[in-house]
Amino acid sequence: QPPPPPPDATCHQVRSFFQRLQPGLKWVPETPVPGSDLQVCLPKGPTCCSRKMEEKYQLTARLNMEQLLQSASMELKFLIIQNAAVFQEAFEIVVRHAKNYTNAMFKNNYPSLTPQAFEFVGEFFTDVSLYILGSDINVDDMVNELFDSLFPVIYTQLMNPGLPDSALDINECLRGARRDLKVFGNFPKLIMTQVSKSLQVTRIFLQALNLGIEVINTTDHLKFSKDCGRMLTRMWYCSYCQGLMMVKPCGGYCNVVMQGCMAGVVEIDKYWREYILSLEELVNGMYRIYDMENVLLGLFSTIHDSIQYVQKNAGKLTTTIGKLCAHSQQRQYR
Amino acid sequence: SAYYPEDLFIDKKVLKVAHVEHEETLSSRRRELIQKLKSFISFYSALPGYICSHSPVAENDTLCWNGQELVERYSQKAARNGMKNQFNLHELKMKGPEPVVSQIIDKLKHINQLLRTMSMPKGRVLDKNLDEEGFESGDCGDDEDECIGGSGDGMIKVKNQLRFLAELAYDLDVDDAPGNSQQATPKDNEISTFHN
């Protein structure tokens, strides 16, 4: 083994290095001392370190470690944070466009329905946005509410324009009839299936991204144990006590220390890998009815089809509803 | 009385969604994100090595510090902790993860379960399985648009796949992130608390 270089007879170099860490020189001995009170940088001979310096080194070592960890995760953190924000905004844009398309469809094809239809469409898409953001709303209920609200207007404005506007009594009956008679055919069920599947996937996708941010934030701000602090101090700073200012830790030794310090963090690895692969699988499946962009931007067309279906079956429906809701209508005409 | 089919499609306005030079859809954006995330798949297992390579370690020097003394870089002593008896590395590993790490692992397990459930072929209706489940991008004449309204000029044209990025206030390329492409790595510019 090569002999160590002679220690700094005056601890002058150590003092000038230590001063950068801790202005004020009172902790650095003038000349090497026995260092019997040291707990980490146990000396083999005289040392230029004091107990106070050792504590400062430990603090600095843990701080260095935290900074290194944060710089290691910076790019990953930025990637997920940016994407989570962009996707959330993009999904809101999709919802806004879907609402506009649906309103435009009503305005162009069914102008007599517009004031009320706009209101119902607006409520529906507000619920869609809330659902994506994690609100506890049932998608089937949202779709049912949309069709329940639309049908009385379609019935009174398109199918039976002779009815007075104050059809509050008949409205309740019509809402009930809408489901019992499957007035819109299988379109509501179709929309429920498509919307619930695509929104569920979208919501989980956003949740997963947000959890990704939480994972990085958690590991980013880990506080390292005292034991780890001692090992880091010994690796990075104990050489200074011997006046070996320019010496660096051995690579293998660094790896051993880091594995020890990060044993807990590394346990995340298995689940992190699975997270990325599961997210990839989800993304690969986000097409057709699992793609909210596709589903929501096509909703106006399916709603249009559903109204056409009602209109084309208007004769049969009007007769059946006339019988079913006759009581409500009579009360109303009185 | 029935609703007469004279001309259902009155409005002559054409609604066009954002024109974007680089036509980018949500699905391409998602795939791009996954590709970038996959480059971080070993992030946690590689952390110890990453931190060592970004903190001062002896690379070209003949001698290096093993925690206790100066040794030759390739000697057996170089990889060993010079002060084995002071406290045990193995013990440190055995302590297990911190409570916050255990908590985040539980959350990861839960989301992974959810993600798997959503991606399960079993949990999915095969595209054409149900009468009512088929759904693809629409069409409008020859140009892959969907139309609101009927034929002729009374329709509203809609881009079927939103070219959404044009509407976002910022571009998302991680490569262009501040301090990202030319990020000064601690290797070149050590964190100020290292004095070498």
């Epitope: 399916t302 | 009385s1 609703y3 489940e133 004449g141």
Partner: antibody, heavy 119, light 107 residues
Framework: QVQLQQSGAELARPGASVKLSCKAS????????ISWVKQITGQGLEWIGE????????YYNEKFKGKATLTADKSSSTAYMELRSLTSEDSAVYFC????????????WGQGTLVTVSA | DIQMTQSPASLSASVGETVTITCRTS??????LAWYQQKQGKSPQLLVY???TLAEGVPSRFSGSGSGTQFSLKINSLQPEDFGSYYC?????????FGAGTKLELK
């Protein structure tokens, strides 16, 4: 102008299946339902069912459930009808027709496809 | 399903004459009825919907009337191109049904 172009005549063995096509042009395919109608030579017309191309939602005459399957391909603006387990009773001319959008009356018809089932 | 009964099954007439074809339904369908003309080897052509509204491009010599269960199609001053088969169809709701047809022949 609106046109519905149907595929050519089919000769099939009993028990076999045939798939007829109806290519639409001159209008937005996804904005209207397409119905299929059967006409046995020299006889009346029978409504088989309809498909809404956008959502591929289908509605059948009970009599033809299990016999006919309606599908649509939006990319080619084509509607299809598959007839399976063919018997001599399925020998007929089959028409596709487009309705007005809000009334079940058919303003536009394909030229018809003759299906002959014979051993 | 709604039954459609057309009469007569066939009739002969000359150019210039006026003819009436009738259609009876098994239940009240209000005005939800359409009439079609079909020539040999061709597809049907819509003449009338909603019992009395003429489809686009249909000559005014054709007229539809009736409501409830009784409907008729009247052709004034028959033209050579008017000969062929005529079908009624209700558009009251699915399933749609057609009459058996009336064959109009040149006398």
């Amino acid at each position: 102008q609106v046109q519905l172009q149907q595929s050519g005549a089919e000769l099939a063995r009993p028990g076999a299946s045939v798939k007829l096509s109806c290519k639409a042009s001159g209008y937005t395919f996804t904005s209207y339902g397409i119905s299929w109608v059967k006409q046995i030579t020299g006889q009346g017309l029978e409504w088989i069912g309809e498909i809404y191309p956008r959502s591929e939602s289908t509605y059948y005459n009970e009599k033809f459930k299990g016999k006919a399957t309606l599908t649509a391909d939006k990319s080619s603006s084509t509607a299809y009808m598959e007839l399976r387990s063919l018997t001599s009773e399925d020998s007929a001319v089959y028409f596709c027709a487009r309705d007005y959008g809000n009334i079940y009356s058919f303003a536009y018809w394909g030229q018809g496809t003759l299906v002959t089932v014979s051993a | 399903d709604i039954q459609m009964t057309q009469s007569p099954a066939s009739l002969s007439a000359s150019v210039g004459e006026t003819v009436t074809i009738t259609c009876r339904t098994s239940e009240n369908i209000y005005s939800y009825l359409a009439w079609y003309q079909q020539k040999q080897g061709k597809s049907p052509q819509l003449l009338v919907y909603n019992a009395k509204t003429l489809a686009e491009g249909v000559p005014s010599r054709f007229s539809g009337s009736g409501s409830g269960t009784q409907f008729s199609l009247k052709i004034n001053s028959l033209q050579p191109e008017d000969f062929g088969s005529y079908y009624c169809q209700h558009h009251y709701g699915t399933p749609l049904t057609f009459g058996a047809g009336t064959k109009l022949e040149l006398k």
